[in-house]
Interface confidence: medium
């Protein structure tokens, strides 16, 4: 949603660098008053600066992308400017003694790199498509998902720095920028004004037909859902074996979506519920101001069935989930594997590089359409991914194994744990895959309490 300002930590650095550049002596006592400086600067024409040791000499400023190495020796002679090294830049004409360090996008704030740092331009950070920025300070922003205005209409579209403004349909009221059914309206809340006619109508003229039909519809709906659930569980095993029976040399999965192109559909999105004072948020319903999509490729339910391991944290709101399914998943007592590792008192063991089974288990269980996103999140660059794909020709499985092996080699042993892979899969909404990986490694027996990977 547009381009960003320089991340926050850079500001003091920039000021410091400018100070060093303008006053190379670094002694504050030698700095002339502002009035004097203006007079001195006006001595030189635009694009030139006054020689720090000789007031009568005007030196040419350095172009953007370069910095001042040596002042010009005399009038009409060239200033010695050198190009900024990799990882640094100058964005305008200057006489700085050092280039400025390139800033980094704040991943923990959901920021993505819009354009890389070059010698004459700093890194530009922004948000993914369908996200807006919440500014914590003048320069630090966090990315959140734009509201979709389900059960309402978009009054004001999502802006770079502002969430969508929604107007709700009749029978719904606005709460946390989401249209909530008037049946959730409590007398103590302000929604009573908006929902009063609706509430009266329901009490006054309740259709007897509706009272009979509604339970029937709900009953058949539940039956249908149960059948669908059982069917999916049955077909899941077949689907998985089919998918991974793509032997090396056969057709490869389709190209994954671009970062900006598509958005992730969460597995079991919950309608967000913002508590009233005194209300205790449960795992299924918590106050969520906004949320973020974390995926780069289109997510289809077939990517990794997650029925065995529902998310325990609040799913992103505004996604229009089936309330029954959402509630069922929210209240499911089965703990997710990552939570078990996180809560465990044991320290996570390292992956055993001598045992390829571990890495193959990951290859087997991460959906091919999400693979590139997965390894990017592990820190592999697009260049490395492409190189390993080329090296392994059309053998996708081996290329994927090589990517994991590369990640394992460069990661300190104590950090290359299944817990870390688990965090990445969690961020990608693939907790079901995580459980499958552990099952592949430990067998279908009950999940162990400690995060041990290898027997």
């Amino acid at each position: 949603m547009g381009l960003s300002t320089v991340p926050d930590l850079l500001l003091p650095l920039v000021l410091l660098e400018l100070l060093v550049g303008i006053y190379p002596s670094g002694v504050i006592g030698l700095v002339p008053h502002l009035g004097d400086r203006e007079k001195r600067d006006s001595v030189c024409p635009q694009g030139k600066y006054i020689h720090p040791q000789n007031n009568s000499i005007c030196c040419t400023k350095c172009h953007k992308g370069t910095y001042l190495y040596n002042d010009c020796p005399g009038p009409g002679q060239d200033t010695d400017c050198r190009e900024c090294e990799s990882g640094s830049f100058t964005a305008s004409e200057n006489h700085l003694r050092h280039c400025l360090s390139c800033s980094k996008c704040r991943k923990e704030m959901g920021q993505v790199e819009i354009s890389s740092c070059t010698v004459d331009r700093d890194t530009v950070c922004g948000c993914r498509k369908n996200q807006y920025r919440h500014y914590w300070s003048e320069n630090l922003f966090q990315c959140f998902n734009c509201s979709l205005c389900l059960n309402g209409t978009v009054h004001l579209s999502c802006q770079e720095k502002q969430n969508t403004v929604c107007t709700c349909h009749a029978g719904f009221f606005l709460r946390e920028n989401e249209c909530v059914s008037c049946s959730n309206c409590k007398k103590s809340l302000e929604c009573t004004k908006l929902c009063l006619p609706q509430i009266e109508n329901v009490k006054g003229t309740e259709d007897s037909g509706t009272t009979v039909l509604l339970p029937l519809v709900i009953f058949f709906g539940l039956c249908l859902l149960s059948l669908l659930f059982i069917g999916l569980m049955y077909r899941y095993q077949r689907w998985k074996s089919k998918l991974y029976s793509i032997v090396c040399g056969k057709s490869t999965p389709e190209k994954e979506g671009e970062l900006e192109g598509t958005t992730t559909k969460p597995l079991a999105p919950n309608p967000s519920f913002s508590p009233t004072p005194g209300f205790t948020p449960t795992l299924g319903f918590s106050p969520v101001p906004s949320s973020t999509f974390t995926s780069s490729s289109t997510y289809t339910p077939g990517d990794c069935p997650n029925f065995a391991a529902p998310r325990r944290e609040v799913a992103p709101p505004y996604q229009g989930a089936d309330p029954i399914l959402a509630t069922a998943l929210a209240s499911d007592p089965i703990p997710n594997p990552l939570q078990k590792w996180e809560d465990s008192a044991h320290k996570p063991q390292s992956l055993d590089t001598d045992d390829p089974a571990t890495l193959y288990a990951v290859v087997e269980n991460v959906p091919p359409l999400r693979w590139k996103e997965f390894v990017r999140r592990l820190g592999l660059s697009d260049h490395e991914i492409d190189r390993l794909e080329l090296q392994n020709g059309r053998c996708l499985r081996e290329a994927q194994y090589s990517m994991l092996a590369t990640w394992r080699r460069r990661t300190p042993r104590r950090e290359a744990t299944l817990e870390l892979l688990g965090r990445v899969l969690r961020d990608m909404d693939l907790l079901g895959c995580l459980e499958d990986i552990e099952e592949a490694l430990c067998g279908p027996a009950a999940l162990p309490p400690a995060p041990s990977l290898l027997r």
Partner: nanobody, 119 residues
Framework: EVQLLESGGGLVQPGGSLRLSCAAS????????MYWVRQAPGKGLEWVSF????????YYADSVKGRFTISRDNSKNTLYLQMNSLRAEDTAVYYC????????????WGQGTLVTVSS
């Protein structure tokens, strides 16, 4: 199980002070950004403050800047919010929240603690 337990709320006169605490358990506290978010009666959620895992970076909403101070004690797994010069408009339920590191989603919340500023 991940738990965030707020305490320290109560009734205070305008101009007074309160210190809120949030005891965290069930996750590696030192690894996460932490937030204070509030909800005034009948109003929406409002970001109050944010602190980075090390505690070196702190940010505040304009409405509380200069009056509130966020801090954390990683050895005690506790998040704090020191509230000075309290005003009637600071009356709200205050929640502490943690986020996943890779995206901005708030995934766990406390049950909230009510702060009432009234004379």
């Amino acid at each position: 199980e991940v738990q965030l337990l707020e305490s320290g709320g109560g009734l205070v006169q305008p101009g007074g002070s309160l210190r809120l605490s949030c005891a965290a358990s069930g996750f590696t506290f030192i690894g996460y950004n932490m937030y204070w978010v509030r909800q005034a009666p009948g109003k929406g959620l409002e970001w109050v403050s944010f602190i980075s895992p090390s505690g070196r970076e702190t940010y505040y909403a304009d409405s509380v800047k200069g009056r509130f101070t966020i801090s954390r004690d990683n050895s005690k797994n506790t998040l704090y919010l020191q509230m000075n010069s309290l005003r009637a408009e600071d009356t709200a339920v205050y929640y502490c929240a943690k986020t996943l590191s890779a995206d901005g989603r708030f995934d766990y919340w406390g049950q909230g603690t009510l702060v009432t500023v009234s004379s």
